[in-house]
């Protein structure tokens, strides 16, 4: 059951984080203009990682995509391709981790398929996360760097009366959504990892077998109870003993069958 | 076509208070941002009031700020201007205005004469 | 506050004769997003309100003749009249609309010589 809650909660939080990452790749407000010297700017303009715009007090917005490919920064074509590994990483582990799901039946499938199914998907969760982490930060470094440069040359023409205010650019929302999304597919991933343990076949199973001391006789009555980690299941079937005690698959075939010796 | 028709001027104390109404046809008053412009006689113009579309904004400049409030009733297709504390120099004609692209006034109504004088 | 100079501040000239006009702000109305320059040329006749002529220094309004041109960038702009007719006979302002508050040059009366 705890595995069952474990692999869906992984699912449904990795679920979410790459809506997320899908969503912060597609938001406009990657960086936005900074407001500090002029809160009450006429004309706002914001940026994202395949067009810029601006919006006009009156209510207009424009935006323009970036169609030139080359003429980019690196920088902004290495997040753009870590925020699409991310994705395409992401979307990937969504579609093994809805096969890996103990509580969807595929044919015949074994347990063991499933639990490495699950962990495939947990890493790729894992590392779609930290693409989107990676991404989000390596922009977030670019418009720190950008921002300090143009503080120091904030105005950059000084003849006279004249002066150009140099447009700073600061956080948008995109990011804090990269972050949050990216940490949550984290988590999803870890948990995918977590409950593949649980959903692993386990060679030996100890069984509990209970002993009645009457006199001198002793009696043992059989009991499908594991003695192990409570996740594994006995694939093999292995009998203890063979007049007595069974595996728990056993006990559940026969219910009303008891064995004494 | 659209128009813009400004009412509520006239003559006050230095002092006192009125609201200056416009309002609006024939074009989709709820997705413009509205200003108020001034004109002194024989004076160059000034802006006065800016309320963004979804009455979330507004923008004034030092000169009637505290004193002036913009707003609007989308539903009544109305833009209002209360003027509190009224001095001699903002005796103007008063003007709505629609803005535009590029932030610029589109649409103008006639103006309102506002005399402010004891 | 951003400061708007208009010159002249009245200009006579010849009907079908060029007429050009200049304003100057203070700081640069560039927008750096969208590479446009906020400024908005308006014609005012007497006893009328003001008419958008052309925004973003250059566009013209709909409905506007095509002999009034908007040119210039940053600080220095030109509304040029490329051939005066009569009914061009007005004052012409020039407006930042790039930063609040929005600020009106002084305006410059147009004449027939």
């Known amino acids: 059951m705890a595995v069952t809650a474990c692999q869906g909660l992984g699912f449904v939080v990795s679920l979410i984080g790459i809506a997320g990452i899908i969503a912060a790749t597609c938001m406009d407000q990657w960086s936005t203009q900074d407001l500090y010297n002029n809160p009450v700017t006429a004309v706002f303009n914001y940026q994202g990682l395949w067009r810029s715009c601006v919006r006009e007090s009156s209510g207009f917005t424009e935006c323009r995509g970036y169609f030139t490919l080359l003429g980019l920064p690196a920088m902004l074509q290495a997040v753009r391709a870590l925020m699409i590994v991310g994705i395409v990483l992401g979307a990937i582990g969504l579609l093994v981790s809805i096969f890996a799901l103990k509580c969807i039946r595929i044919g015949s499938m074994e347990d063991s398929a499933k639990a490495n199914m699950t962990l495939t998907s947990g890493i790729m969760f894992i590392v779609s996360g930290l693409c989107a982490i990676a991404g989000v930060s390596v922009f977030a470094n670019m418009l720190v760097t950008n921002f300090w440069m143009s503080t120091a040359n904030m105005y950059t023409g000084m003849g006279g009366m004249v002066q150009t205010v140099q447009t700073r650019y600061t956080f948008g929302a995109a990011l804090f959504v990269g972050w949050v999304a990216g940490g949550l597919t984290l988590i999803g991933g870890v948990m995918m990892c977590i409950a593949c343990r649980g959903l692993a076949p386990e060679e030996t199973n100890y069984k509990a077998v209970s002993y009645h001391a009457s006199g001198h006789s002793v009696a043992y009555k059989p009991g499908g109870f594991k003695a192990s980690t409570g996740f594994g299941s006995n694939t093999k079937n292995k009998k203890i003993y063979d007049g007595g005690a069974r595996t728990e698959d056993e006990v559940q075939s026969y219910p009303s069958k008891h064995d004494y010796v | 076509e659209v128009q813009l028709l400004e009412s509520g001027g006239g003559l006050v104390q230095p002092g006192g208070s009125l609201r200056l109404s416009c309002a609006a046809s024939e074009f989709t008053f709820s997705n413009y941002a509205m200003s108020w412009v001034r004109q002194a006689p024989g004076k160059r113009l000034e802006w006065v009031a800016t309320?963004?579309?979804?009455?979330?904004?507004?923008y004034y400049p030092d000169s009637v700020k505290g004193r002036f409030t913009i707003s609007r009733d989308n539903s009544k297709n109305t833009l209002y201007l209360q003027m509190n504390s009224l001095r001699a120099e903002d005796t103007a004609v008063y003007y709505c205005?629609?803005?535009?692209?590029?932030?610029?006034?589109?649409?103008w109504g006639q103006g309102t004469l506002v005399t402010v004088s004891s | 506050d951003i400061v708007m100079t208009q010159s002249p501040d009245s200009l006579a000239v010849s009907l079908g004769e060029r007429a050009t006009i200049s304003c100057k702000s203070s700081q640069s109305l560039l927008n750096s997003g969208n590479q446009k320059n906020y400024l908005t040329w308006y014609q005012q006749k007497p006893g009328q309100p003001p008419k958008l002529l052309i925004y973003w220094a250059s566009t013209r309004e709909s409905g506007v003749p095509d002999r009034f041109t908007g040119s210039g960038s940053g600080t220095d702009f030109t509304l040029t009249i490329s051939s005066l007719q009569a009914e061009d006979v007005a004052v012409y302002y020039c407006q930042n609309a790039y930063s609040y508050p929005f600020t009106f040059g002084g305006g410059t009366k147009l004449e027939i010589k």
């Open positions: 205005a629609g803005l535009g692209r590029g932030n610029a006034m589109e649409y």
């Open positions: 309320i963004s579309s979804g009455r979330s904004s507004t």
